[in-house]
């Protein structure tokens, strides 16, 4: 390389990360194996759980405004879970990104898309519940499944828009020990006349904006909505929280616990540009809190089920039905199950809690399985605990 050839410009914190070398320490190797195992398990669980939630809520339940929110949350979590196997591979090959720059950008973007989408959707759920209680007449007239889908579409668009900088500034950087990092490189595009200033301002802007937009603002909306609802319900003499309240509370708590540490370390990382003493703490902590944030997508489906009564009994029954469906003779399948389409109108008003507590006749195992295999969301809505919790919108 000639003396005049300017090396790829990197921010100091990134260049120092590229200088860190791996050790073949036995205890570190053991931790790495454990991490690969844990992330591999989380990948599998996340994909299965969110896939099941998407299928059950999207195809096996009566569509309401609440099921729409959960459907989109599960979709966001499924996306994040789908990216986890690649992160597991990154860990398995010794913390080196071997999948190229484009995929590095895409993979990271999914993580941030999930971060923004989760925050925005939880805000929408809380505002929706607040409007139901504070403006019941307006809610009765305007709360439709179609409207909820439109809101979700807008929120997804906002999430994508907020993810663009993370896509643009993600890059693959070669470490001096031969490994490859997939990380922020804020000097990648138009570094400006002064790299130090650009590094400081862009890293701070990214950290603060994601903390505000994907964490603080959603939590503020959730908290204020909850306060407004609590005050209104106190006046009405309501005491015990309904099923949906418990579900939302659990999901919000998981969101705060899983994403909170990530944002703390992200802000510390921004400070570490000017304060190198913080860098070792950030380098040690960020991988853990990033994994914790990923695991939020695995935790959510569990929470949907756990916050509903009779969970284990219903779960066992569902599993038995699925097994019966799978183990049935080919000759018994026939052509059943694919003809019946879901009759719920896309603009149907959200059902009252009582409307979904009755038990319509369920299609038998083979019919349900075939309906699923043929891509039909045909079977009648199920009324298990999850359904009841997701449908109890007035609580």
């Amino acid at each position: 390389m000639s003396a005049n050839a300017t090396l790829k410009p990197l921010c100091p914190i990134l260049e120092q990360m590229s200088r860190l070398q791996s050790h073949s320490n036995t205890s570190i190797r053991y931790i790495d194996h454990a991490a690969v195992l844990l992330h591999g398990l989380a990948s599998l669980l996340g994909l299965v759980e969110n896939g099941v939630i998407l299928f059950v809520v999207g195809c096996r339940m009566r569509q309401t405004v609440v099921t729409t929110w959960v459907l989109h949350l599960a979709l966001s979590d499924l996306l994040a879970s789908a990216s986890l196997p690649f992160f597991t591979y990154f860990l398995a090959v010794g913390h080196s990104w071997e999948l190229g720059t484009t995929f590095c950008k895409l993979h990271s973007s999914i993580f941030f898309l999930n971060m923004f989408a989760s925050g925005f959707l939880l805000s929408a759920i809380s505002l929706d519940r607040c409007l139901q209680v504070v403006r019941p007449v307006w809610a009765q007239n305007h709360r439709t499944v179609a409207a909820a889908h439109k809101v979700c579409l807008v929120l997804w668009a906002l999430a994508v828009l907020n993810t663009v900088p993370y896509f643009v500034f993600r890059d693959t950087i070669s470490r001096l020990d031969g490994r490859i990092m997939c990380y922020y490189n804020v000097l990648l595009l138009n570094p400006g006349p002064d790299r130090d200033a650009t590094c400081n301002s862009r890293q701070a802007a990214l950290a603060v904006s994601k903390f505000l937009l994907a964490f603080l603002v959603p939590l503020a909306i959730i908290a204020s909505s909850h306060a407004a609802v609590s005050l209104r319900l106190q006046h009405r003499g309501r005491r015990r929280p309904g099923r949906f309240v418990r579900l939302v509370a659990a999901v919000v708590a998981a969101f705060a616990l899983c994403w909170g540490p990530y944002h703390v370390f992200s802000l510390l990382e921004a400070r570490a540009h000017a304060n190198p003493g913080l860098r070792p703490l950030v380098w040690r902590g960020l991988p853990f809190v990033t994994s914790l944030a990923f695991f939020n997508s695995v935790a959510n489906p569990v929470l949907y089920v756990l916050t509903c009564p009779d969970m284990l009994r219903k779960l066992r029954r569902s599993l038995r039905t699925v097994l019966e469906s799978v183990l049935v003779d080919d000759s018994e399948l026939g052509g059943a199950g694919s003809s019946r389409r879901r009759r719920t109108s896309s603009t149907a008003r959200s059902a009252s809690p009582l409307a979904l507590c009755s038990r319509p006749e369920e299609p038998r195992g083979p019919a349900r399985l075939l309906g699923w295999l043929l891509g039909s969301c045909a079977a009648s809505p199920q009324t298990g605990p999850l359904n009841r919790a997701l449908s109890s919108t007035s609580s």
Partner: antibody, heavy 118, light 107 residues
Framework: EVQLVESGGGLVQPGGSLRLSCAAS????????MSWVRQAPGKGLEWVAR????????DYPGTVEGRFTISRDNSKNTLYLQMNSLRAEDTAVYYC???????????WGQGTLVTVSS | DIQMTQSPSSLSASVGDRVTITCRAS??????LAWYQQKPGKAPKLLIY???QLAEGVPSRFSGSGSGTDYTLTISSLQPEDFATYYC?????????FGQGTKVEIK
Amino acid sequence: EVQLVESGGGLVQPGGSLRLSCAASGFTFSSYLMSWVRQAPGKGLEWVARISNGGSTTDYPGTVEGRFTISRDNSKNTLYLQMNSLRAEDTAVYYCARHRTNWDFDYWGQGTLVTVSS
Amino acid sequence: DIQMTQSPSSLSASVGDRVTITCRASENIYYNLAWYQQKPGKAPKLLIYAATQLAEGVPSRFSGSGSGTDYTLTISSLQPEDFATYYCQHFWITPWTFGQGTKVEIK
């Protein structure tokens, strides 16, 4: 070929001021961070100041902070070191050095001698 | 400030000898270390950066190793032109300090 040429050194009385210059050529000056390093006669090396490629950020060790000011003029490909309130212990050969990336001085000038004496 | 302690302060060796110079930092410097060679009346020359990386145009007989607080410069087979003073310098937290130097002399 990369070249760094220091000038402005000389004899100065304690408490006096001096401005050193470093003319750069053979590379894109505005793309590189720059530093000043000094070496007292028969002694080791001491880093004195550092400036970012655009000039917005500067750093100094405690020994010179508040007395020395590093600056640059990218249009003239020149680095400067303004030295005020000079002391006898500031007597040294002053080198300007180019940073390889954010650190590591890969090219040095030939140095200019500053003598602080009454 | 981080203190850099070089040892030995001087050594005598013959052409063809293997020479090792060590540099110890008062705290972990995370591989942010450079080695320089300086000959009398000349400016220093970069040999090694990031603790282990050979600078451009430097002969392969020079190598750097180490981690944490302890770093080493090795000259595998000393050549006549290698008789000089060697300095280590950290680039972790400012101020970036140098070691006091190791003078390699002809035995």
